[in-house]
């Protein structure tokens, strides 16, 4: 051990005053003194790799991790950031030793992770892991729970790094599809961090706090089911556990079961299985394949063999940022008065969105299906048919999403009216919208039939109330039509709506009010 | 260089509360997942794990003594502080600080024990 | 609670012989386990974490291993100064516990 070069891991913070991009070197700022990160041999890891105390800062921050190294001799290095190199300019301190940094200015989701310094001294090699993780401001948290296997048991931990301390549950379903649902008979809860009956058919681990509840399902592959029509998808980041357990009954013993990523066994100690005989006296198998913390190369079609079933396939998808998959453009309907309608959004995301509708700047509850495509549908059915702007918006932590939906209801105008001293106003919020006709009342046509052709002023869809269009028309009187009686109709394809005024009057004077359909 | 210096009443009566300050240096308890931990040792006794609090606010308890114990941080004067309640002659010890480096790995974290230690303050409960 | 047994509690050792300590969990720790030496009126030292990684700067005579419930420490060839008490301490559950500590004196 004492051949072993003497290294010191720091973490230099610094006051901001730059909006400049990281680089591996050394960069004139403001600093705080260094802080000592114990650095540490990692335990049974293939080589030599020594380990910084995770960095935790917020967004924003511009920090300096840097190495300082007792050895003799001239050293080379590399630092690689999520698979990209980046360069490296080590230089000597007055104490002669070797010193790399890696700077890293305004702090963004992006560049955290782990960062991995390789260096090359002339007695040995060895590697040096720094993680960066982004400190949540916010003082509570809830994240979404991830397994563990329990050590040397057949059990399953449920862990959620949240604040405050979650209560963690488990969620069990031996039925299949609809019946699985929260409040179902079929459902039983577990308030425990372990799990020993891994063998039901649909397993999730629940996690809540203040901030509500956020759950993970555990994916598997039922050798017995029918295999779905497009092949099950499953995201997962890069850093984040992989579990995938395939499942398999058969009338006896005599089966076995195995994992393959692209045809190629999965490496010992990536899998577990366990069996047990169901009340029938079938035999019940689970295989479970398992990365504690998955990279790039961990993509790839998982299959799940059988001596007595057909094989099924995974696609394990493996991404650096969670997203968002959907179209963004804004959609229109238009709808009868008593038409069942509900909006839609169909996306894939990972991880799960939190979403919201609104309208009219009220937020509604937003409910997510699982579809069997990979996709997953939200729907919003109670807009009473208000006609208008609604929004869905989704955010998973790492992508956001809005989509702009118009709700038109098809309907007949109704018409108010206004008299001003030197006008007369009529508006109408029918769909589509109406089109406008003012008609004099005199003794010459005492049913409002003569025409107004001058003076009129159409405004279609002058104001955008919530997205509901309205439309006015407006008559500049002159001295002529003082004393007399207007009628302002609005028209559709649906029918006619008017509203007679006198034009003396200040206020309206809804006289009549016609409907001719 | 890393320091952890405990600070404290040398005497106490018994059924007083015992409040101890570990002032730390050359880390932070704000940018890295550090822990700071207290340990005691009794005259010509074995060494206890008191207690230990953690950058996230993250905090645990020794089960006997959890009812007596409060462990918090001052972040902007680096400082940890213990209290024990309803003291006793047989909490006559030495009490340590001792900082605790957290590690990741994947979503885990990884905590290796104490790696430096303050140098210990005795603490006498005598009436 | 996690009980620690060390054993012995004390030994006696001269200069330049190997010297074996061992501890015992009351259940499965894995390697969630350090060896410390405290020298009287001392704050104590780690000497090996994660069961048998050697800390930076302690010289390469101590040695340990084990994993589950058994561990041991090992010193290939004792030197004055190790003349110490050693404690064990596992960190795999709360809360931590030590063991109750090994004398080596001289002989």
């Known amino acids: 051990n004492q051949d072993l070069p003497v290294i010191k891991c720091v973490l230099i913070n610094h006051k901001n005053n730059d909006s400049s991009v990281g680089k591996s070197s050394s960069y004139p700022m403001v600093s705080e003194s260094p802080e000592d990160l114990g650095c540490a041999l990692r335990p049974q890891s293939a080589g030599t790799v020594y380990e910084a105390a995770t960095v935790e800062v917020d967004v924003s921050a511009s920090i300096t991790l840097q190495v300082l190294v007792d050895t003799p001799g001239n050293i080379s290095c590399l630092w690689v950031f999520k698979h990209s190199s980046l360069n490296c300019q080590p230089h000597f301190d007055v104490q002669n030793r070797g010193v790399v940094s890696m700077v890293i200015l305004k702090m963004t989701e992006t560049q955290a992770g782990e960062y991995l310094l390789f260096i090359q001294s002339e007695a040995t090699n060895y590697t040096i892991v720094f993680t960066v993780s982004i400190r949540n401001t916010l003082l509570f948290t809830l994240r979404r729970p991830y397994f563990r296997k329990m050590e040397n048991q057949d059990a399953l931990v449920c862990i959620s790094e949240s604040v405050p301390e979650p209560i963690v549950e488990w969620v069990l379903c031996d039925s299949q599809g609809e019946s699985c649902k929260e409040e179902s008979p079929a459902v039983v809860k577990k308030e425990e961090k372990v799990l020993h009956e891994l063998f039901g058919t649909d397993i999730r681990c629940c996690a809540r706090n203040e901030l509500g509840r956020e759950c993970t399902r555990l994916f598997t592959i039922d050798l017995n089911q029918t295999p779905q029509t497009t092949l099950p998808q499953l995201f997962l980041k890069v850093g984040e556990p992989l579990w995938i357990r395939c499942k398999a009954v058969h009338v006896n013993h005599g089966f076995g079961l195995t994992w393959e990523l692209e045809n190629k066994a999965l490496e010992e100690g990536s899998y577990f299985e366990m069996s047990t005989y169901s009340t029938n006296r079938t035999m019940i198998r689970i295989l479970f394949a398992f990365v504690s913390s998955v990279a790039r190369n961990d993509t790839g079609y998982y299959t799940c063999s059988s001596s007595k079933h057909p094989s099924q396939s995974a696609l394990v998808t493996i991404v650096e940022k969670g997203f968002i998959n959907a179209t963004n453009s804004s959609e229109d309907y238009e709808i009868d008065q008593y038409e069942e309608f509900c909006f839609s959004v169909r996306f894939k995301a990972y991880p799960q969105i939190r979403c919201t509708w609104t309208f009219s700047r009220k937020a509604f509850p937003c409910e997510q299906k699982a579809l069997d495509d990979g996709y997953s549908v939200s729907k919003f059915c109670n807009h009473k048919h208000q006609p208008g702007e609604y929004i869905f918006h989704a955010e998973n932590g790492d992508a956001q999403f809005t989509k702009m939906f118009t709700l038109n209801i098809r309907r007949k105008p109704q018409v108010l009216a206004e008299a001003s001293a030197s006008q007369a106003s009529c508006s109408s919020d029918g769909y589509p919208l109406p089109s406008w006709t003012w008609k004099k009342c005199s003794d010459k046509s005492p049913n409002c039939t003569e025409d107004i052709p001058e003076g009129v002023w159409n405004r279609k869809a002058n104001r955008k109330v919530f997205g509901q269009w309205v439309s006015s028309s407006t008559l500049n009187m002159s001295e002529a039509m003082k004393g007399f009686l207007v009628k302002c109709c609005a028209y559709n394809s649906l029918g006619t709506s008017c509203e007679t005024i006198l034009l003396n009057s200040p206020g309206p004077f809804p006289f009549i009010q016609d409907s001719i359909s | 260089q890393v320091t952890l210096k405990e600070s404290g009443p040398v005497l106490v009566k018994p059924t007083e509360t015992l409040t101890l300050t570990c002032t730390v240096s050359g880390f932070s308890l704000i940018n890295a997942r550090m822990g700071v931990t207290w340990i005691r040792q009794p005259p010509g006794k074995a060494l206890e794990w008191l207690a230990h609090i953690f950058s996230n606010d993250e905090k645990s308890y020794s089960t006997s003594l959890k009812s007596r114990l409060t462990i918090s941080k001052d972040t902007s004067k680096s400082q940890v502080v213990l209290t024990m309640t309803n003291m006793d002659p047989v909490d006559t010890a030495t009490y340590y600080c001792?900082?605790?480096?957290?590690?990741?790995?994947?979503?885990?974290?990884?905590?290796?024990?104490?790696?430096?230690w303050g140098q210990g303050t005795m603490v006498t409960v005598s009436s | 609670d996690i009980q620690m047994t060390q054993s012995p509690s004390s030994l006696s050792a001269s200069v330049g012989d190997r010297v074996t300590i061992t501890c015992r969990a009351s259940?499965?720790?894995?390697?969630?386990l350090g060896w410390y030496q405290q020298k009287p009126g001392k704050a104590p030292k780690r000497l090996i974490y994660?069961?048998?990684t050697l800390q930076s700067g302690v010289p390469s005579r101590f040695s340990g291993s084990g994993s589950g419930t058994e561990f041991t420490l090992t010193i290939s060839s004792l030197q004055p100064e190790d003349f110490a008490t050693y404690y064990c301490?596992?960190?795999?559950?709360?809360?931590?516990?030590f063991g109750q500590g090994t004398k080596v004196e001289i002989k």
């Open positions: 001792a900082r605790i480096p957290g590690y990741s790995r994947g979503w885990d974290y990884y905590y290796y024990g104490m790696d430096v």
């Open positions: 259940q499965g720790i894995r390697n969630d």
């Open positions: 301490l596992q960190h795999n559950s709360y809360p931590w516990t």
């Open positions: 994660a069961a048998s």
